[in-house]
Amino acid sequence: CKAMHVAQPAVVLASSRGIASFVCEYASPGKATEVRVTVLRQADSQVTEVCAATYMMGNELTFLDDSICTGTSSGNQVNLTIQGLRAMDTGLYICKVELMYPPPYYLGIGNGTQIYVIDPEPCPDSDF
């Protein structure tokens, strides 16, 4: 089958600081040297791009400075971290992987990770 399979966890719970991490793993049909990873958020029928990064195999994954994502890569595995999440950001986060170079191009789309974000309760005022 000329296709690329992408695996990611079904569910992740963000930390109380609004940080969620998950692994996106892809089974590469070819020997790619340039890979693009995109995180998409699907809410209802709306899809938005959360962040994206292109990296050379063996090099670090670099997102734009103002991105809410950071990540590291190791072989066919990408460790993604999304920060600054709030309860309203709860949703399905889909990992999209593209083998950009050399040809042929391959597209791989994961089934998505449902990220649950719970806003922390405000600390009650303390009387000292």
Partner: antibody, heavy 118, light 108 residues
Framework: QVQLVESGGGVVQPGRSLRLSCAAS????????MHWVRQAPGKGLEWVAV????????YYADSVKGRFTISRDISKSTLYLQMNSLRVEDTAIYYC???????????WGQGTMVTVSS | EIVLTQSPGTLSLSPGERATLSCRAS???????LAWYQQKPGQAPRLLIY???SRATGIPDRFSGSGSGTDFTLTISRLEPEDFAVYYC?????????FGQGTKVEIK
């Protein structure tokens, strides 16, 4: 709204050149792969070329490789197709299309007709 | 390259009838990367279905897609007058991107 508008088509002699443009609006141009697809009169759809996000990676159909060049100007949100050494069999309507988030071609322009004839 | 073969070439049906269009791939295609398009005379193609079975924005639910491996199907449950057109399948999981030759759905 999200829109693609092609221009630059016309009648040209075999061996000559033509440059097509596709002006994009209503979306972040740099976030999508952009394709050219053509359709010869009375025939089906044929994928021609694609350029990716930063414009560095490009792929071509074997039928146009070495003759056509795809490019994009992100500052102008415009896609181009430079067609050299045109042949009679290149006669077609040329469409630009956006590769959507999930890969399918979700937005299409109205098309521009290219006729190669002596 | 992955060759897509559509059948039948032409489908003659009446409004209200069910249309079943077939798309067969020369090698296995992941169901995530199979799309269907509709094209009316003088118009650009329009995305109907992506990922084999997901309807694109604004597409009515009388259109549905199914299949896996090498065999895929587009079904129009009850043909409306505006559904008479040419339909193309496409694979977009690997380069080169390829289309089927099309199936024309015409009024009987």
């Amino acid at each position: 709204q999200v829109q693609l508008v092609e221009s630059g088509g016309g009648v040209v002699q075999p061996g000559r050149s033509l440059r097509l443009s596709c002006a994009a609006s209503g979306f972040t141009f740099s976030s999508f792969g952009m394709h050219w697809v053509r359709q010869a009169p009375g025939k089906g759809l044929e994928w021609v070329a694609v350029t990716w996000y930063n414009g560095r990676n490009k792929y071509y159909a074997d039928s146009v490789k070495g003759r056509f060049t795809i490019s994009r100007d992100i500052s102008k949100s415009t896609l181009y197709l430079q067609m050299n050494s045109l042949r009679v069999e290149d006669t077609a309507i040329y469409y630009c299309a956006r590769g959507g988030y999930y890969g399918a071609f979700d937005i299409w322009g109205q098309g521009t007709m290219v006729t190669v004839s002596s | 390259e992955i060759v897509l073969t559509q059948s039948p070439g032409t489908l003659s049906l009446s409004p209200g009838e069910r249309a079943t269009l077939s798309c067969r791939a020369s090698q296995s295609v992941s169901s995530s990367y199979l799309a269907w398009y509709q094209q009316k005379p003088g118009q650009a193609p329009r995305l109907l279905i992506y990922g084999t079975s997901s309807r694109a924005t604004g597409i009515p639910d009388r259109f549905s897609g199914s299949g896996s491996g090498t065999d895929f199907t587009l079904t129009i449950s009850r043909l409306e007058p505006e559904d008479f057109a040419v339909y193309y399948c496409q694979q977009y999981g690997t380069s080169p991107w390829t289309f089927g030759q099309g199936t024309k759905v015409e009024i009987k």
